[in-house]
């Protein structure tokens, strides 16, 4: 049961951040313009990573699309790449989870495949937050150094006084956006990974042979050979049938009260 | 066609206020800011502030601010502005102005405020 | 606030001819975002609500004819009428609005000589 929560709330999780990043990439406030020296501007300019846009004194927005490619700082592009790819590979993770997914039969779909699966989509959805993550945190890097770089060219010239005055980019609420997505991503990737281990197979246990010595009655049961998962050993609780054994965290090949939800 | 139609005018006592609406038509209410501007006799068009027909939200020149108030009715596409503490200087044309490139005029309130 | 000085306050030419008149900002209006300058040119005729010529300092509102034309960037601008018709005899107002308060020119009245 503890098992489907934490795939189930891992799921939820990394859709949530998926669509926060899609969102983020999708969003045209990236930057927007730093009102700290023109508090009172009548024209607010804010960028995307695909267009920028002006809004107007008469209240109209008008945006403009990046057409060129390679006119492009290689930094802009470089964030672009790495929101694509962490949006690809969330969702091709929102994919193969829902396949892994506990509460949902496919077919006669081994544990071990559901495992390997939840495990392949927490990895998906750990790289997917993370490449989210790096990109939004590129671009405020990008942001910030430009900043102080404008900064300091609105304080020289002719004593100071600029009579065009550079406009200046901080933090748009994209940014915040991504980096929220993203640490949930990642937060659904992990708990995916914690997921598969309870749903991996972790001891394949033969029929308890008995060998009696004569004048002694000690058994020799050959149980020591165990499956290896890669994810350690769970030894709490094992219950030894005729029929070989099983962990209580496995799902049972006929239906239970939580196989449908 | 986009039209802003302005009430008639008015003859206020200094210390009085006013109220002067604006109409639109022709276009979405909601689409763009409504504008004021004032115009006193032999002068300079002076900007007294807008509203975001949107959400309310205002802003004011600091010449009115505290005895200009900005306000609408959606529902009507109607766009009011007051103004209180009347002084014989307030005697001016009152335009609302909208659209993209503030492009489209009322064509203007007389407000006279003589005692 | 943006002052916004226009010269000269009046103006007598006869029909036919060319005509300039200047504005000019106290800050600029060069907006880096989208390349614009936020300056808008009006004509007023007496008893009558400003009427849109030209935006963004050079473009002209559609309806107001090729004979007006607008240039400039930053702080100063030029409001040029290549042939006066009898029609454009009127007071022209340059406006900022790039930052508020949106304040205006003083006006340039263009009267028949």
């Known amino acids: 049961m503890a098992v489907t929560a934490c795939q189930g709330l891992g799921f939820v999780v990394s859709l949530i951040g998926i669509a926060g990043i899609i969102a983020a990439t999708c969003m045209d406030q990236w930057s927007t313009q730093d009102l700290y020296n023109n508090p009172v501007t009548a024209v607010f300019n804010y960028q995307g990573l695909w267009r920028s846009c002006v809004r107007e004194s008469s209240g109209f927005t008008e945006c403009r699309g990046y057409f060129t490619l390679l006119g492009l700082p290689a930094m802009l592009q470089a964030v672009r790449a790495l929101m694509i790819v962490g949006i690809v590979l969330g969702a091709i993770g929102l994919l193969v989870s829902i396949f892994a997914l506990k509460c949902i039969r496919i077919g006669s779909m081994e544990d071990s495949a559901k495992a390997n699966m939840t495990l392949t989509s927490g990895i998906m959805f750990i790289v997917s937050g993370l490449c989210a993550i790096a990109g939004v945190s590129v671009f405020a890097n990008m942001l910030v150094t430009n900043f102080w770089m404008s900064t300091a060219n609105m304080y020289t010239g002719m004593g100071g006084m600029v009579q065009t005055v550079q406009t200046r980019y901080t933090f748009g609420a994209a940014l915040f956006v991504g980096w929220v997505a993203g640490g949930l991503t990642l937060i659904g990737g992990v708990m995916m990974c914690i997921a598969c281990r309870g749903l991996a197979p972790e001891e394949t246990n033969y029929k308890a042979v008995s060998y009696h010595a004569s004048g002694h009655s000690v058994a020799y049961k050959p149980g020591g050979f165990k499956a290896s998962t890669g994810f350690g050993s769970n030894t709490k609780n094992k219950k030894i049938y005729d029929g070989g054994a099983r962990t209580e965290d496995e799902v049972q090949s006929y239906p239970s009260k939580h196989d449908y939800v | 066609q986009v039209q802003l139609v302005q009430s008639g005018a008015e003859v206020k006592k200094p210390g009085a206020s006013v109220k002067v609406s604006c109409k639109a038509s022709?276009?979405?209410?909601?689409?763009?800011?409504m504008h004021w501007v004032r115009q006193a006799p032999g002068q300079r068009l002076e900007w007294m502030g807008y509203i975001n027909p949107n959400n309310g939200g205002t802003s004011y020149s600091q010449k009115f601010q505290g005895r200009v108030t900005i306000t609408r009715d959606t529902s009507a596409s109607t766009a009011y502005m007051e103004l209180s503490s009347l002084r014989s200087e307030d005697t001016a044309v009152y335009y609302c102005?909208?659209?993209?490139?503030?492009?489209?005029w009322g064509q203007g309130t007389t407000v006279t405020v003589s005692s | 606030d943006i002052q916004m000085t226009q010269s000269p306050s009046s103006l007598s030419a006869s029909v036919g001819d060319r005509v300039t008149m200047t504005c000019k900002s106290s800050?600029?209006?060069?907006?880096?975002?989208?390349?614009?300058?936020?300056l808008t040119w009006y004509q007023q005729k007496p008893g009558k609500a400003p009427k849109l010529l030209i935006y963004w300092a050079s473009t002209r509102e559609s309806g107001v004819p090729s004979r007006f034309s607008g240039s400039g960037s930053g702080t100063d601008f030029t409001l040029t009428i290549s042939s006066l018709q009898p029609e454009d005899f009127a007071t022209y107002y340059c406006?900022?609005?790039?930052?508020?308060?949106?304040?205006f020119g003083g006006g340039t009245k263009l009267e028949i000589k």
């Open positions: 022709g276009y979405t209410f909601t689409d763009y800011n």
């Open positions: 102005v909208t659209t993209r490139y503030l492009a489209v």
């Open positions: 406006q900022n609005d790039y930052s508020y308060p949106l304040t």
């Open positions: 800050q600029s209006l060069f907006n880096s975002g989208n390349q614009k300058n936020y």
